[in-house]
């Protein structure tokens, strides 16, 4: 057992049919040494006296809200959750596979620069009775500050039957160095509640690896006299980090017919324009990557090609 | 070229051949997303490799202050993985493919090692572990972590040059 | 006059390489997607490959060892043929595309590759 | 890659018929293919693309329809000058591919 956060610990059991459990000794927060009575939840059951309570904890409901009371007088609470081990691996039931980029990815990153800022995102079917808590730091063994804020419910989705919701927090690296060449990763740690079950989540990446830019910004089209062709101009994302000249980008241009079965045009370029051959409902899309290190391509930012 | 003094390097030839690193340093190892190497407890294998610091300098405004700093931290990191990927870690067993990019890419850093220091010049460089791994597949996985971090280092010194030919050219 | 000239052909060597032209007159070549096509000696039209802006497809038996590229301020088309074998022997024509390359508007007269030791 | 199955391979017809050939692809194409006519020694002529669209200056006769896998180009009315062999075209997003080829001959 440990202790979450004050007066809330967890209880960590192997969970496998006929399990022993696991021996708990509540004690309760107060001076007082004798007529201590404790209840769980909102039972008036007494479940022991003396001012402490030892438990046999083996299933949810041996979880839950201790209390102890002198006279009818509330003294103090301790909040079990369990977390389940299963073939000594520990539950992931909360949050659902992300499956990208690979299995068991339950949290997703992105940073849109190399300022030390980075958004990371999770998902579930759970609607109620569900917390989380965000911890990050950089480097394990001696970490170094990145500050978290309240994850919050970003988007609900419904996929056939269930409703999928979507959960994200910022983070900020307290002294970045966006020039320098990572060796630490930076470590992000989820704590997921849901009633009385409690689980961990953790993902370890590099700022470099999570870098996804913007799309190109202020897309242009201007037609080039007696020809079909196009010259396509296009300007770095606001988010991107400064200098240009340091933190440069390159782009990738496509000219896509209406349908997805029609060959695309692609032209790659580190520059900011580029020259296209246009043709009746086709549309123009430019997306940007990072220029020396092959992170995520950006979102397309597009226009008509008339 | 950075010779002693301090004069400034060729910044254009080495931006051009800082930029062929990471387009060889990414075909040489392209599937890095797929495979993270930090599970494998690598830290005894390649943590000892030089890193471009927070306070090397190879910053915009410490590149504009003093690029001789950054330059000799770029060139110690060149020679040490020149001298890896010259090592029996990428010429023993398993062989190479004949195409591997890994050739071209040990003497493009040979040639950008040059560029910033001539003969007769020699900046102190950083002495290389013995990395010695006896299994085929010991070796196979340390090649994919030098090349990881190959990338993340010549990422760093293409940003230097780019940078430094764009505003730091005479 | 709008027109398209195809140069190059001629006897080849198994094995042998060969590069053909195809020069565009009267209309600006870069505007357009081209493409190569050929016909065996009393067989059906061929697909070879195409080219866009700069984004090139081939036929699955042409990726390897022919290649399509284009040089606009010659306003010239070229298809570069390496490896040859017997099965090449063809006429091959370039072609515009109207919209992308299914739709060819505009072909060369054809230039005749022999493929022959 | 698709296929584009072209029937029939010969066809003898006489002046003022009523000519039909079908182009059939092994997956659905939409609206990409065209219709070419060629004459012996000569290069190929665009008569039909996006299936049913005349290209200018061929005469009405001609006509094309379908959408996706089945494909067909009509002659109204058989000329002297249509004695030639024609061949659909078809692409999707990474191939394009002829059909084997029509022979129209004189009955």
């Known amino acids: 057992i440990w202790e979450l956060k004050k007066d809330v610990y967890v209880v960590e059991l192997d969970w496998y049919p006929d399990a022993p459990g696991e021996m708990v000794v509540l004690t309760c927060d107060t001076p007082e040494e004798d007529g201590i009575t404790w209840t769980l939840d909102q039972s008036s059951e007494v479940l022991g006296s003396g001012k402490t309570l030892t438990i046999q904890v083996k299933e949810f409901g041996d979880a839950g809200q201790y209390t102890c009371h002198k006279g009818g007088e509330v003294l103090s609470h301790s909040l079990l959750l369990l977390h389940k081990k299963e073939d000594g691996i520990w539950s992931t039931d909360i949050l659902k596979d992300q499956k990208e980029p690979k299995n068991k990815t339950f949290l997703r990153c992105e940073a849109k620069n190399y300022s030390g800022r980075f958004t990371c995102w999770w998902l579930t079917t759970i609607s109620t009775d569900l917390t989380f808590s965000v911890k990050s730091s950089r480097g394990s063994s001696d970490p170094q500050g990145v500050t978290c804020g309240a994850a919050t419910l970003s988007a609900e989705r419904v996929r056939g039957d269930n409703k999928e919701y979507e959960y994200s927090v910022e983070c900020q690296e307290d002294s970045a160095c966006p020039a320098a060449e990572e060796s630490l990763p930076i470590e992000v740690m989820v704590d997921a509640v849901h009633k009385l079950k409690y689980e961990n989540y953790t993902s370890s990446f590099f700022i470099r690896d999570i870098i996804k830019p913007d799309p190109p910004k202020n897309l242009q089209l201007k037609p080039l006299k007696n020809s079909r062709q196009v010259e396509v101009s296009w300007e770095y994302p606001d988010t991107w980090s400064t200098p240009h000249s340091y933190f440069s980008l390159t782009f990738c241009v496509q000219v896509q017919g209406k349908s997805k079965r029609e060959k695309k045009d692609r032209v790659f370029t580190d520059k900011t324009s580029a020259t296209v051959i246009c043709r009746k409902n086709a549309s123009i899309s430019v997306r940007a990557q990072d220029r020396y290190y092959s992170s995520s391509w950006s979102e397309w930012a597009s226009v008509p090609c008339s | 070229r950075a010779v002693p003094g301090g004069s400034s390097p060729a910044w254009t030839q080495c931006q051009q051949l800082s930029q062929k690193l990471c387009t060889l340093a990414w075909s040489a190892h392209p599937l890095v997303g797929h495979m993270d190497l930090r599970e494998e407890g690598d830290e005894e294998t390649t943590n000892d490799v030089p890193h471009i610091q927070c306070g090397d300098g190879c910053d915009p405004q410490g590149l504009r202050d003093n690029s001789q700093f950054c330059l000799q931290r770029i060139h110690q990191g060149l020679i040490f993985y020149e001298k890896l990927l010259g090592s029996d870690i990428f010429t023993g067993e398993p062989s190479l493919l004949p195409d591997s990019p890994v050739g071209q890419l040990h003497a493009s850093l040979l040639g950008l090692s040059q560029l910033l220091q001539p003969e007769g010049h020699h900046w102190e460089t950083q002495q290389i572990p013995s990395l010695s791994p006896s299994q085929p597949w010991q070796r196979l996985l340390l090649r994919f972590k030098i090349l990881r971090s190959l990338q993340a280092f010549v990422a760093v010194a293409a940003r230097v040059f780019a940078h430094g030919a764009a505003t730091l050219s005479p | 006059e709008v027109q398209l000239v195809e140069s190059g052909g001629g006897l080849v060597q198994p094995g042998g390489s060969l590069r053909l032209s195809c020069t565009a007159s009267?209309?600006?070549?870069?505007?357009?997607?081209m493409t190569w096509v050929r016909q065996a000696p009393g067989k059906g039209l061929e697909w070879v490959g195409t080219?866009?802006?700069?984004?090139?497809y081939y036929a699955s038996w042409a990726k390897g060892r022919f290649t399509i590229s284009r040089d606009n301020s010659k306003n010239t088309l070229y298809l570069q043929m390496n490896s040859l074998r017997a099965e090449d022997t063809a006429v091959y024509y370039c072609?515009?595309?109207?919209?992308?390359?299914?739709?060819?508007?505009?072909w060369g007269q054809g230039t005749l590759v022999t493929v022959s030791s | 890659d698709i296929q584009l199955t072209q029937s029939p391979s010969f066809l003898s017809a006489s002046v003022g018929d009523r000519v039909t050939i079908t182009c059939q692809a092994s997956?659905?194409?939409?609206?990409?293919l065209a219709w070419y006519q060629q004459k012996p020694g000569k290069a190929p002529k665009l008569l039909i693309y996006?299936?049913?669209t005349l290209t200018s200056g061929v005469p009405s006769r001609f006509s094309g329809s379908g959408s996706g896998t089945e494909f067909t180009l009509t002659i109204s009315s058989l000329q002297p000058e249509d004695f030639a062999t024609y061949y659909c075209?078809?692409?999707?997003?990474?191939?394009?591919?002829f059909g084997g080829g029509t022979k129209v001959e004189i009955k």
């Open positions: 072609a515009r595309g109207l919209t992308t390359d299914y739709d060819l508007d505009l």
């Open positions: 080219i866009a802006t700069s984004s090139t």
């Open positions: 075209l078809g692409a999707d997003d990474t191939t394009t591919v």
């Open positions: 997956e659905d194409i939409e609206s990409y």
């Open positions: 996006s299936a049913s």
């Open positions: 009267g209309f600006s070549l870069s505007s357009y997607w």
